[in-house]
Protein backbone atom coordinates (compact mmCIF):
# COMPACT_ATOMS: atom_id res chain seq x y z
CA UNK A 1 0.00 0.00 0.00
CA UNK A 2 2.72 2.44 0.99
CA UNK A 3 5.23 1.36 -1.62
CA UNK A 4 7.33 4.47 -1.99
CA UNK A 5 8.57 5.64 1.39
CA UNK A 6 11.15 8.36 0.97
CA UNK A 7 13.60 9.13 3.77
CA UNK A 8 16.58 11.42 4.03
CA UNK A 9 20.11 10.24 3.27
CA UNK A 10 22.73 10.25 6.00
CA UNK A 11 25.49 12.93 6.10
CA UNK A 12 23.14 15.38 4.41
CA UNK A 13 23.16 19.12 4.92
CA UNK A 14 20.76 19.85 7.83
CA UNK A 15 18.90 22.41 5.72
CA UNK A 16 16.71 21.74 2.67
CA UNK A 17 18.31 19.37 0.18
CA UNK A 18 17.45 18.06 -3.27
CA UNK A 19 19.44 14.82 -2.85
CA UNK A 20 16.61 12.89 -1.24
CA UNK A 21 15.80 9.19 -1.22
CA UNK A 22 12.71 7.45 -2.54
CA UNK A 23 9.67 9.60 -3.19
CA UNK A 24 10.89 12.82 -1.55
CA UNK A 25 11.15 15.89 -3.75
CA UNK A 26 12.74 17.99 -1.01
CA UNK A 27 13.94 16.92 2.42
CA UNK A 28 15.96 17.95 5.44
CA UNK A 29 18.24 16.15 7.86
CA UNK A 30 15.97 16.82 10.79
CA UNK A 31 12.45 16.60 9.32
CA UNK A 32 12.85 13.97 6.60
CA UNK A 33 10.70 14.63 3.53
CA UNK A 34 9.40 18.17 3.16
CA UNK A 35 7.63 17.60 -0.15
CA UNK A 36 6.93 14.64 -2.41
CA UNK A 37 7.30 13.67 -6.04
CA UNK A 38 4.10 13.94 -8.14
CA UNK A 39 1.16 11.71 -7.18
CA UNK A 40 2.68 10.68 -3.83
CA UNK A 41 1.08 11.60 -0.51
CA UNK A 42 2.90 13.52 2.18
CA UNK A 43 2.37 12.25 5.72
CA UNK A 44 3.87 13.12 9.08
CA UNK A 45 5.06 10.09 11.01
CA UNK A 46 5.68 10.42 14.73
CA UNK A 47 8.98 8.91 15.86
CA UNK A 48 9.39 9.44 19.58
CA UNK A 49 9.01 13.16 20.20
CA UNK A 50 9.80 14.02 16.59
CA UNK A 51 7.60 14.18 13.48
CA UNK A 52 9.23 12.97 10.29
CA UNK A 53 7.83 13.63 6.81
CA UNK A 54 7.38 10.59 4.59
CA UNK A 55 6.14 10.17 1.02
CA UNK A 56 3.70 7.35 0.32
CA UNK A 57 1.83 5.98 -2.67
CA UNK A 58 -1.39 6.12 -0.60
CA UNK A 59 -2.32 7.18 2.90
CA UNK A 60 -1.79 4.57 5.63
CA UNK A 61 -4.49 3.11 7.85
CA UNK A 62 -5.95 5.76 10.13
CA UNK A 63 -5.37 8.58 7.60
CA UNK A 64 -7.27 10.05 4.67
CA UNK A 65 -5.83 11.80 1.64
CA UNK A 66 -6.56 15.24 0.20
CA UNK A 67 -5.27 16.11 -3.26
CA UNK A 68 -4.57 19.84 -3.05
CA UNK A 69 -3.28 21.61 -6.19
CA UNK A 70 0.27 21.74 -4.82
CA UNK A 71 0.46 18.76 -2.45
CA UNK A 72 -1.23 15.44 -1.76
CA UNK A 73 -1.54 15.31 1.99
CA UNK A 74 -2.47 12.62 4.51
CA UNK A 75 -4.50 13.76 7.52
CA UNK A 76 -5.15 11.69 10.60
CA UNK A 77 -8.62 10.26 11.19
CA UNK A 78 -10.07 10.38 14.71
CA UNK A 79 -8.31 8.13 17.24
CA UNK A 80 -10.89 5.31 17.17
CA UNK A 81 -11.15 5.29 13.36
CA UNK A 82 -9.27 3.02 10.96
CA UNK A 83 -10.52 4.43 7.64
CA UNK A 84 -12.29 7.74 7.15
CA UNK A 85 -13.70 9.98 4.46
CA UNK A 86 -12.68 13.06 6.42
CA UNK A 87 -12.36 14.24 10.02
CA UNK A 88 -16.12 14.04 10.54
CA UNK A 89 -16.95 10.76 8.86
CA UNK A 90 -15.39 7.44 9.73
CA UNK A 91 -16.02 4.54 7.34
CA UNK A 92 -14.31 1.75 9.33
CA UNK A 93 -13.61 1.73 13.05
CA UNK A 94 -10.69 0.32 14.97
CA UNK A 95 -11.12 -3.05 16.65
CA UNK A 96 -13.60 -2.97 19.54
CA UNK A 97 -15.68 -0.13 18.10
CA UNK A 98 -18.85 -0.18 16.03
CA UNK A 99 -19.53 2.20 13.16
CA UNK A 100 -22.78 4.15 13.24
CA UNK A 101 -23.47 7.13 10.97
CA UNK A 102 -19.80 7.94 10.56
CA UNK A 103 -18.98 7.69 14.27
CA UNK A 104 -17.23 4.94 16.22
CA UNK A 105 -19.12 3.73 19.29
CA UNK A 106 -18.34 1.29 22.13
CA UNK A 107 -21.93 0.03 21.98
CA UNK A 108 -24.72 0.36 19.48
CA UNK A 109 -27.60 2.73 20.29
CA UNK A 110 -31.01 1.50 21.43
CA UNK A 111 -32.94 -0.22 18.65
CA UNK A 112 -29.78 -1.22 16.80
CA UNK A 113 -27.51 -4.22 17.12
CA UNK A 114 -23.86 -4.87 16.43
CA UNK A 115 -22.99 -6.78 13.30
CA UNK A 116 -19.75 -8.46 14.35
CA UNK A 117 -18.85 -9.24 10.75
CA UNK A 118 -19.00 -5.67 9.41
CA UNK A 119 -18.47 -4.07 12.85
CA UNK A 120 -21.36 -1.71 12.14
CA UNK A 121 -24.54 -0.91 14.03
CA UNK A 122 -27.49 -2.21 12.05
CA UNK A 123 -31.26 -2.21 12.45
CA UNK A 124 -32.70 -5.15 14.35
CA UNK A 125 -34.54 -7.40 11.90
CA UNK A 126 -37.45 -9.48 13.21
CA UNK A 127 -38.62 -12.75 11.73
CA UNK A 128 -41.38 -12.58 9.16
CA UNK A 129 -43.41 -15.61 8.08
CA UNK A 130 -45.98 -16.13 5.35
CA UNK A 131 -49.61 -17.12 5.89
CA UNK A 132 -50.21 -20.80 6.55
CA UNK A 133 -50.58 -22.97 3.47
CA UNK A 134 -53.74 -25.16 3.41
CA UNK A 135 -53.86 -28.30 5.55
CA UNK A 136 -52.58 -31.41 3.81
CA UNK A 137 -54.95 -34.33 3.22
CA UNK A 138 -55.67 -36.46 6.30
CA UNK A 139 -53.27 -39.41 6.16
CA UNK A 140 -52.07 -42.33 8.22
CA UNK A 141 -48.72 -43.96 7.44
CA UNK A 142 -48.72 -42.10 4.16
CA UNK A 143 -52.16 -43.30 3.02
CA UNK A 144 -55.53 -41.56 2.78
CA UNK A 145 -57.69 -44.72 3.02
CA UNK A 146 -58.33 -47.70 5.24
CA UNK A 147 -58.39 -45.84 8.57
CA UNK A 148 -60.57 -43.54 10.65
CA UNK A 149 -58.07 -41.35 12.49
CA UNK A 150 -54.89 -39.85 11.03
CA UNK A 151 -52.91 -36.62 10.93
CA UNK A 152 -52.81 -33.57 8.70
CA UNK A 153 -50.05 -30.99 8.38
CA UNK A 154 -49.71 -27.42 7.22
CA UNK A 155 -46.61 -25.30 6.61
CA UNK A 156 -45.61 -21.66 6.15
CA UNK A 157 -42.46 -20.07 4.78
CA UNK A 158 -39.91 -17.78 6.41
CA UNK A 159 -39.97 -14.53 4.45
CA UNK A 160 -37.35 -12.73 6.58
CA UNK A 161 -34.83 -14.45 8.82
CA UNK A 162 -34.21 -12.51 12.05
CA UNK A 163 -30.97 -10.80 12.98
CA UNK A 164 -29.19 -11.70 16.23
CA UNK A 165 -31.44 -9.54 18.43
CA UNK A 166 -34.57 -9.98 16.33
CA UNK A 167 -37.66 -11.94 17.36
CA UNK A 168 -37.28 -15.66 16.69
CA UNK A 169 -39.40 -17.26 14.02
CA UNK A 170 -42.59 -18.98 15.14
CA UNK A 171 -43.18 -22.64 14.15
CA UNK A 172 -43.30 -23.18 10.41
CA UNK A 173 -44.89 -26.67 10.59
CA UNK A 174 -48.07 -27.65 12.39
CA UNK A 175 -49.54 -31.13 12.69
CA UNK A 176 -52.88 -32.14 14.20
CA UNK A 177 -55.04 -35.21 14.49
CA UNK A 178 -57.88 -35.60 12.04
CA UNK A 179 -60.72 -37.99 11.37
CA UNK A 180 -62.10 -39.14 8.05
CA UNK A 181 -65.04 -41.18 6.91
CA UNK A 182 -63.63 -44.69 6.92
CA UNK A 183 -63.27 -45.95 3.40
CA UNK A 184 -61.74 -49.11 2.07
CA UNK A 185 -58.55 -48.83 0.05
CA UNK A 186 -59.08 -49.52 -3.61
CA UNK A 187 -57.04 -52.18 -5.36
CA UNK A 188 -53.46 -50.94 -5.69
CA UNK A 189 -53.86 -48.28 -3.00
CA UNK A 190 -52.90 -50.76 -0.27
CA UNK A 191 -49.78 -51.85 -2.13
CA UNK A 192 -46.51 -52.68 -0.40
CA UNK A 193 -47.18 -50.42 2.58
CA UNK A 194 -50.27 -52.32 3.58
CA UNK A 195 -48.48 -55.72 3.49
CA UNK A 196 -45.56 -54.38 5.49
CA UNK A 197 -47.86 -52.98 8.15
CA UNK A 198 -49.59 -56.34 8.71
CA UNK A 199 -46.28 -58.08 9.35
CA UNK A 200 -44.82 -55.42 11.60
CA UNK A 201 -45.26 -55.94 15.35
CA UNK A 202 -45.84 -52.85 17.50
CA UNK A 203 -42.78 -51.53 19.33
CA UNK A 204 -42.54 -52.09 23.07
CA UNK A 205 -44.11 -49.20 24.97
CA UNK A 206 -45.75 -47.78 21.84
CA UNK A 207 -48.72 -45.73 23.06
CA UNK A 208 -52.16 -45.93 21.56
CA UNK A 209 -53.22 -43.09 19.28
CA UNK A 210 -54.70 -40.12 21.15
CA UNK A 211 -58.44 -39.76 20.73
CA UNK A 212 -59.57 -36.36 19.43
CA UNK A 213 -62.17 -34.44 21.43
CA UNK A 214 -65.87 -35.42 21.19
CA UNK A 215 -66.65 -32.66 18.67
CA UNK A 216 -64.16 -34.21 16.28
CA UNK A 217 -65.60 -37.66 16.80
CA UNK A 218 -69.16 -36.40 16.31
CA UNK A 219 -68.28 -34.96 12.96
CA UNK A 220 -66.83 -38.28 11.86
CA UNK A 221 -69.99 -40.34 12.35
CA UNK A 222 -70.98 -42.21 9.24
CA UNK A 223 -73.72 -40.36 7.36
CA UNK A 224 -75.76 -40.85 4.22
CA UNK A 225 -73.89 -40.38 0.96
CA UNK A 226 -75.84 -37.29 -0.15
CA UNK A 227 -74.84 -35.33 3.01
CA UNK A 228 -71.11 -35.99 2.64
CA UNK A 229 -70.10 -32.59 1.23
CA UNK A 230 -71.88 -30.55 3.91
CA UNK A 231 -70.51 -32.81 6.61
CA UNK A 232 -66.94 -32.44 5.28
CA UNK A 233 -67.25 -28.63 5.36
CA UNK A 234 -68.51 -28.69 8.94
CA UNK A 235 -65.69 -31.03 9.97
CA UNK A 236 -63.08 -28.61 8.49
CA UNK A 237 -64.49 -25.67 10.45
CA UNK A 238 -64.37 -27.61 13.70
CA UNK A 239 -60.83 -28.83 13.07
CA UNK A 240 -59.52 -25.38 12.20
CA UNK A 241 -60.73 -24.19 15.60
CA UNK A 242 -58.77 -26.92 17.35
CA UNK A 243 -55.34 -26.04 18.68
CA UNK A 244 -52.49 -27.87 17.01
CA UNK A 245 -51.42 -30.88 19.01
CA UNK A 246 -47.82 -31.13 17.93
CA UNK A 247 -45.18 -28.86 16.49
CA UNK A 248 -42.39 -30.18 14.39
CA UNK A 249 -40.26 -27.26 13.22
CA UNK A 250 -39.20 -24.12 15.09
CA UNK A 251 -36.72 -21.56 13.69
Amino acid sequence: QNASRGRRQRRMHPNVSQGCQGGCATCSDYNGCLSCKPRLFFALERIGMKQIGVCLSSCPSGYYGTRYPDINKCTKCKADCDTCFNKNFCTKCKSGFYLHLGKCLDNCPEGLEANNHTMECVSIVHCEVSEWNPWSPCTKKGKTCGFKRGTETRVREIIQHPSAKGNLCPPTNETRKCTVQRKKCQKGERGKKGRERKRKKPNKGESKEAIPDSKSLESSKEIPEQRENKQQQKKRKVQDKQKSVSVSTVH
Epitope: T66, Y68, D70, F85, N86, K87, N88, F89
Partner: antibody, heavy 116, light 107 residues
Protein backbone atom coordinates in the same frame (compact mmCIF):
# COMPACT_ATOMS: atom_id res chain seq x y z
CA UNK B 1 -24.36 23.17 17.57
CA UNK B 2 -22.30 24.19 14.54
CA UNK B 3 -22.99 27.73 13.33
CA UNK B 4 -21.52 29.73 10.46
CA UNK B 5 -22.82 33.27 10.05
CA UNK B 6 -21.86 35.30 7.00
CA UNK B 7 -22.01 39.08 6.81
CA UNK B 8 -20.83 41.92 4.57
CA UNK B 9 -22.96 41.30 1.49
CA UNK B 10 -24.79 44.05 -0.33
CA UNK B 11 -25.08 45.96 -3.58
CA UNK B 12 -21.85 47.19 -5.10
CA UNK B 13 -20.85 48.76 -8.41
CA UNK B 14 -18.66 46.89 -10.93
CA UNK B 15 -14.96 47.41 -10.29
CA UNK B 16 -15.49 48.10 -6.59
CA UNK B 17 -14.53 45.95 -3.59
CA UNK B 18 -16.37 44.16 -0.82
CA UNK B 19 -15.24 42.16 2.19
CA UNK B 20 -17.27 39.26 3.51
CA UNK B 21 -16.87 37.81 6.99
CA UNK B 22 -17.94 34.49 8.50
CA UNK B 23 -18.15 33.91 12.25
CA UNK B 24 -17.83 30.25 13.23
CA UNK B 25 -18.86 28.48 16.42
CA UNK B 26 -19.71 24.99 17.68
CA UNK B 27 -16.65 23.22 16.24
CA UNK B 28 -12.86 23.49 16.38
CA UNK B 29 -12.43 26.14 13.70
CA UNK B 30 -8.63 25.89 13.66
CA UNK B 31 -8.82 22.17 12.68
CA UNK B 32 -10.71 22.82 9.46
CA UNK B 33 -9.93 24.10 6.01
CA UNK B 34 -12.56 26.75 5.30
CA UNK B 35 -14.07 27.66 1.96
CA UNK B 36 -16.38 30.05 0.14
CA UNK B 37 -18.91 28.60 -2.28
CA UNK B 38 -21.26 30.80 -4.30
CA UNK B 39 -24.55 30.38 -6.11
CA UNK B 40 -25.73 32.80 -8.78
CA UNK B 41 -29.52 33.35 -8.82
CA UNK B 42 -31.26 30.25 -10.20
CA UNK B 43 -27.93 28.56 -10.91
CA UNK B 44 -25.75 25.79 -9.46
CA UNK B 45 -22.99 25.77 -6.85
CA UNK B 46 -19.51 27.10 -7.65
CA UNK B 47 -16.47 26.72 -5.43
CA UNK B 48 -14.71 30.06 -4.97
CA UNK B 49 -11.79 29.58 -2.58
CA UNK B 50 -10.37 27.45 0.24
CA UNK B 51 -7.87 28.39 2.93
CA UNK B 52 -6.20 25.58 4.84
CA UNK B 53 -6.62 25.16 8.59
CA UNK B 54 -3.58 27.19 9.64
CA UNK B 55 -3.95 29.93 7.01
CA UNK B 56 -0.65 29.10 5.35
CA UNK B 57 -2.05 28.23 1.90
CA UNK B 58 -5.09 29.22 -0.12
CA UNK B 59 -6.59 28.03 -3.40
CA UNK B 60 -8.94 29.80 -5.78
CA UNK B 61 -11.37 29.00 -8.58
CA UNK B 62 -10.32 30.16 -12.06
CA UNK B 63 -13.05 32.82 -12.26
CA UNK B 64 -11.82 34.73 -9.17
CA UNK B 65 -8.08 34.04 -9.08
CA UNK B 66 -6.11 37.28 -8.87
CA UNK B 67 -9.16 39.31 -7.78
CA UNK B 68 -10.24 37.62 -4.56
CA UNK B 69 -8.19 36.82 -1.48
CA UNK B 70 -9.15 34.65 1.48
CA UNK B 71 -7.87 34.90 5.04
CA UNK B 72 -8.72 33.67 8.51
CA UNK B 73 -8.21 34.61 12.13
CA UNK B 74 -8.19 31.43 14.20
CA UNK B 75 -8.10 33.39 17.46
CA UNK B 76 -11.45 34.98 16.49
CA UNK B 77 -12.90 31.91 14.70
CA UNK B 78 -13.51 34.10 11.67
CA UNK B 79 -13.08 33.62 7.92
CA UNK B 80 -12.83 36.48 5.40
CA UNK B 81 -13.23 36.92 1.66
CA UNK B 82 -11.81 40.08 0.15
CA UNK B 83 -13.41 40.66 -3.25
CA UNK B 84 -11.79 43.24 -5.55
CA UNK B 85 -12.55 44.30 -9.12
CA UNK B 86 -16.07 42.96 -8.83
CA UNK B 87 -17.99 42.06 -11.98
CA UNK B 88 -21.68 41.55 -12.73
CA UNK B 89 -21.04 37.79 -12.96
CA UNK B 90 -19.91 37.78 -9.31
CA UNK B 91 -23.54 38.42 -8.31
CA UNK B 92 -24.48 35.47 -6.10
CA UNK B 93 -25.25 34.21 -2.64
CA UNK B 94 -21.89 33.54 -0.95
CA UNK B 95 -21.75 30.67 1.51
CA UNK B 96 -19.07 30.11 4.12
CA UNK B 97 -18.40 26.39 4.59
CA UNK B 98 -16.09 23.96 6.39
CA UNK B 99 -14.23 22.18 3.61
CA UNK B 100 -12.79 18.77 4.38
CA UNK B 101 -13.12 17.04 0.98
CA UNK B 102 -16.88 17.48 1.33
CA UNK B 103 -18.50 20.72 2.47
CA UNK B 104 -19.75 19.55 5.85
CA UNK B 105 -21.05 22.72 7.52
CA UNK B 106 -22.68 25.66 5.74
CA UNK B 107 -23.71 29.17 6.71
CA UNK B 108 -27.04 30.66 5.63
CA UNK B 109 -25.31 32.75 2.94
CA UNK B 110 -24.96 36.46 2.19
CA UNK B 111 -26.14 38.06 -1.04
CA UNK B 112 -23.71 40.07 -3.15
CA UNK B 113 -25.18 42.07 -6.03
CA UNK B 114 -22.80 43.72 -8.50
CA UNK B 115 -24.73 46.30 -10.48
CA UNK B 116 -24.28 49.77 -11.86
CA UNK C 1 -10.72 20.00 -13.86
CA UNK C 2 -13.04 17.06 -13.28
CA UNK C 3 -16.35 17.50 -15.12
CA UNK C 4 -19.65 16.45 -13.53
CA UNK C 5 -22.69 15.69 -15.69
CA UNK C 6 -25.85 15.42 -13.61
CA UNK C 7 -29.16 14.22 -15.02
CA UNK C 8 -31.98 14.93 -15.31
CA UNK C 9 -31.84 18.69 -14.76
CA UNK C 10 -35.44 18.61 -13.55
CA UNK C 11 -37.85 15.86 -12.59
CA UNK C 12 -41.57 15.79 -11.78
CA UNK C 13 -42.74 13.06 -9.45
CA UNK C 14 -45.48 12.24 -6.95
CA UNK C 15 -45.39 11.40 -3.26
CA UNK C 16 -44.58 7.69 -2.91
CA UNK C 17 -42.66 7.51 -6.20
CA UNK C 18 -39.19 6.01 -6.48
CA UNK C 19 -36.79 8.47 -8.10
CA UNK C 20 -33.24 8.19 -9.35
CA UNK C 21 -30.74 10.95 -10.11
CA UNK C 22 -27.43 10.16 -11.82
CA UNK C 23 -24.07 11.85 -12.00
CA UNK C 24 -21.36 10.97 -14.53
CA UNK C 25 -17.80 12.00 -13.74
CA UNK C 26 -15.12 12.67 -16.36
CA UNK C 27 -12.50 10.52 -14.63
CA UNK C 28 -12.28 7.69 -12.12
CA UNK C 29 -12.74 9.14 -8.64
CA UNK C 30 -13.18 5.86 -6.72
CA UNK C 31 -15.89 6.66 -4.12
CA UNK C 32 -14.79 10.23 -3.36
CA UNK C 33 -18.24 11.52 -4.04
CA UNK C 34 -20.93 13.50 -2.20
CA UNK C 35 -24.63 14.37 -2.62
CA UNK C 36 -26.30 17.53 -1.26
CA UNK C 37 -29.92 18.60 -0.90
CA UNK C 38 -30.92 22.25 -1.14
CA UNK C 39 -34.32 23.73 -0.40
CA UNK C 40 -35.34 27.18 -1.73
CA UNK C 41 -33.72 30.03 0.19
CA UNK C 42 -31.62 27.65 2.27
CA UNK C 43 -28.00 26.48 2.25
CA UNK C 44 -27.19 23.07 0.80
CA UNK C 45 -27.16 20.19 3.26
CA UNK C 46 -24.86 17.19 2.99
CA UNK C 47 -26.91 14.00 2.43
CA UNK C 48 -24.46 11.28 1.41
CA UNK C 49 -20.66 11.04 1.58
CA UNK C 50 -18.22 8.43 0.27
CA UNK C 51 -20.78 7.70 -2.50
CA UNK C 52 -23.12 5.59 -0.35
CA UNK C 53 -22.95 6.58 3.32
CA UNK C 54 -25.83 8.47 4.86
CA UNK C 55 -25.14 11.56 6.92
CA UNK C 56 -26.62 11.49 10.44
CA UNK C 57 -30.30 12.47 10.39
CA UNK C 58 -30.88 11.60 6.74
CA UNK C 59 -33.85 9.21 6.32
CA UNK C 60 -33.11 5.69 5.11
CA UNK C 61 -35.29 6.18 2.01
CA UNK C 62 -32.25 7.99 0.58
CA UNK C 63 -29.46 5.83 -0.78
CA UNK C 64 -26.37 6.41 -2.84
CA UNK C 65 -24.47 3.99 -5.03
CA UNK C 66 -21.68 3.89 -7.57
CA UNK C 67 -17.92 4.00 -7.83
CA UNK C 68 -15.46 5.20 -10.44
CA UNK C 69 -17.36 7.42 -12.86
CA UNK C 70 -21.07 6.56 -12.44
CA UNK C 71 -23.03 7.55 -9.35
CA UNK C 72 -26.70 7.38 -8.40
CA UNK C 73 -28.91 8.93 -5.75
CA UNK C 74 -32.17 7.05 -5.13
CA UNK C 75 -35.16 8.09 -3.07
CA UNK C 76 -37.20 4.92 -2.54
CA UNK C 77 -40.53 6.55 -1.67
CA UNK C 78 -40.78 10.30 -2.12
CA UNK C 79 -42.07 12.32 0.82
CA UNK C 80 -43.39 15.91 0.59
CA UNK C 81 -40.23 17.26 2.28
CA UNK C 82 -37.99 15.67 -0.39
CA UNK C 83 -39.02 18.13 -3.12
CA UNK C 84 -35.82 20.15 -3.46
CA UNK C 85 -32.73 20.54 -5.66
CA UNK C 86 -30.00 17.89 -5.46
CA UNK C 87 -26.33 18.44 -6.28
CA UNK C 88 -23.46 15.99 -6.66
CA UNK C 89 -19.81 16.86 -5.94
CA UNK C 90 -16.52 15.08 -6.50
CA UNK C 91 -14.20 15.21 -3.52
CA UNK C 92 -11.35 13.37 -5.23
CA UNK C 93 -9.15 16.36 -6.00
CA UNK C 94 -8.95 20.13 -6.36
CA UNK C 95 -10.75 22.05 -7.59
CA UNK C 96 -13.92 20.62 -6.03
CA UNK C 97 -16.57 20.49 -8.74
CA UNK C 98 -20.36 20.18 -8.60
CA UNK C 99 -23.02 18.78 -10.88
CA UNK C 100 -25.46 21.27 -12.41
CA UNK C 101 -28.24 20.18 -10.04
CA UNK C 102 -31.53 18.29 -10.35
CA UNK C 103 -34.73 20.12 -9.39
CA UNK C 104 -37.26 17.64 -8.05
CA UNK C 105 -40.78 19.01 -8.39
CA UNK C 106 -44.25 17.79 -7.45
CA UNK C 107 -46.17 16.34 -10.40
Amino acid sequence: EVQLVESGGGVVQPGRSLRLSCAASGFTFSDYDMAWVRQAPGKGLEWVATIIYDGSRAYFGDSVRGRFTVSRDNSKNTLYLQMNSLRAEDTAVYYCTAHDRSFDYWGQGTMVTVSS
Amino acid sequence: DIQMTQSPSSLSASVGDRVTITCLVSEDISNDFVWYQQKPGKAPKLLIYAASRLQDGVPSRFSGSGSGTDFTLTISSLQPEDFATYFCQQSYKYPPTFGQGTKLEIK
